[in-house]
Interface confidence: low
Amino acid sequence: QGGAAEGVQIQIIYFNLETVQVTWNASKYSRTNLTFHYRFNGDEAYDQCTNYLLQEGHTSGCLLDAEQRDDILYFSIRNGTHPVFTASRWMVYYLKPSSPKHVRFSWHQDAVTVTCSDLSYGDLLYEVQYRSPFDTEWQSKQENTCNVTIEGLDAEKCYSFWVRVKAMEDVYGPDTYPSDWSEVTCWQRGEIRDACAETPTPPKPKLSK
């Protein structure tokens, strides 16, 4: 998505099928207020952005309300009347789901079921990563609803958990973004803990899609 024209790099993120953020990095125009013009239909007139993002006092992006839009975004980034980057993109291919909400843990002996509120659209994977202080890497399990059961845990160990949502690649394509992680929560013997005291600094979680 970052293809350059006149040295302009762009990034598109479609937050939770609600808001589209288009940002640009144009070294040639670093001290210029570029304008962003867009339309959702190929045969409509362009509208100008009304909600710019600023970096060091200059425009660097645009936020658009686009709730569950069924569309291609046609856009043009301009220096005055001169287009410096023009493109069209299926917005949904740049989906970033929202972070899991209402995450709950239900313990039964050596297993835990992690649940959260499913998002209002489909073809998502809900991924739970977990580790104890004795694990060198995060373990991972995912399901296509937010109801993930992890078995074979050691009741005596303290485990850290967090959850995120990913778009299925065979539906949305390869250019989506995983959601932000939920907050880390720590559990031992079925009870929540402030932290897993003996936990060394956790390694970065695997960020593969």
Epitope: E67, R69, D70, D71, Y121, D123, D170
Partner: antibody, heavy 119, light 107 residues
Framework: QVQLQQSGPEVVRPGVSVKISCKGS????????IHWVRQSHAKSLEWIGI????????NCDQKFKDKATMTVDKSSSTAYLDLARLTSEDSAIYYC????????????WGQGTLVTVSA | DIVMTQSQKFMSTSVGDRVSVTCKAS??????IAWYQQKPGQSPEALIY???YRYSGVPDRFTGSGSGTDFTLTITNVQSEDLAEYFC?????????FGGGTKLEIK
């Protein structure tokens, strides 16, 4: 141009099953989702469910889960709706329609298949 | 399930008039609403998506508005070919649901 061509009318006895088809043309079949909707005098338009030809994923209204089975044949760009254990209440026009792969509105519709359940 | 209510089953209007078809959702659906027109003996046709955006080829006398729970399809300068039934539909959450329809009669 985009077309969804459905199979012809069916007259069936109560208790049997029927399979109706919807052939897509003029677009890349796996880039979209196919929906099934039925229309009867009693119930107006009812959404049955969605299937994504790219991976066969389906989502069906719970009230149709024992009645309707959606499948696709990617090689022929055709979606199928299998209706089981038909009763007179299933007599209706069944439409296929197309949306973006993740959802959105139903931009294109087939011509409909009339299913009549009669003893 | 989200219930879509079109309280008027029939509306009568004259050529050249303006008419508004309303639709109410039982819970907030944002702007995830479409409107369809179904002429007698034909399949439904999409008019409006995302509450207010016309499909290409749809005459600009058709206008959609609203968000949340209350939506309106307005037809200005009604033409005889607008004789049809109009349905709203939500696609905020599964199962997708339709309103019961409003039949527009031309006097």
């Amino acid at each position: 141009q985009v077309q969804l061509q459905q199979s012809g009318p069916e007259v069936v006895r109560p208790g049997v099953s029927v399979k109706i088809s919807c052939k897509g043309s003029g677009f890349t079949f796996t880039d979209y989702a196919i929906h099934w909707v039925r229309q009867s005098h009693a119930k107006s338009l009812e959404w049955i469910g969605i299937i994504r030809p790219s991976n066969g994923n389906t989502n069906c209204d719970q009230k149709f889960k024992d009645k309707a089975t959606m499948t696709v044949d990617k090689s022929s760009s055709t979606a199928y709706l299998d209706l089981a254990r038909l009763t007179s209440e299933d007599s209706a026009i069944y439409y296929c329609s197309r949306s973006r792969v993740w959802g959105g509105s139903l931009a294109y519709w087939g011509q409909g298949t009339l299913v009549t359940v009669s003893a | 399930d989200i219930v879509m209510t079109q309280s008027q089953k029939f509306m009568s209007t004259s050529v050249g008039d303006r008419v508004s078809v309303t639709c109410k959702a039982s819970q907030n659906v944002g702007t995830n609403i479409a409107w369809y027109q179904q002429k007698p003996g034909q399949s439904p046709e999409a008019l409006i998506y995302s509450a207010s955006y016309r499909y290409s080829g749809v005459p600009d006398r058709f206008t959609g508005s609203g968000s949340g729970t209350d939506f309106t399809l307005t037809i200005t300068n009604v033409q005889s070919e607008d004789l049809a039934e109009y349905f709203c539909q939500q696609y905020k959450s599964y199962p997708w649901t339709f309103g019961g329809g409003t039949k527009l009669e031309i006097k």
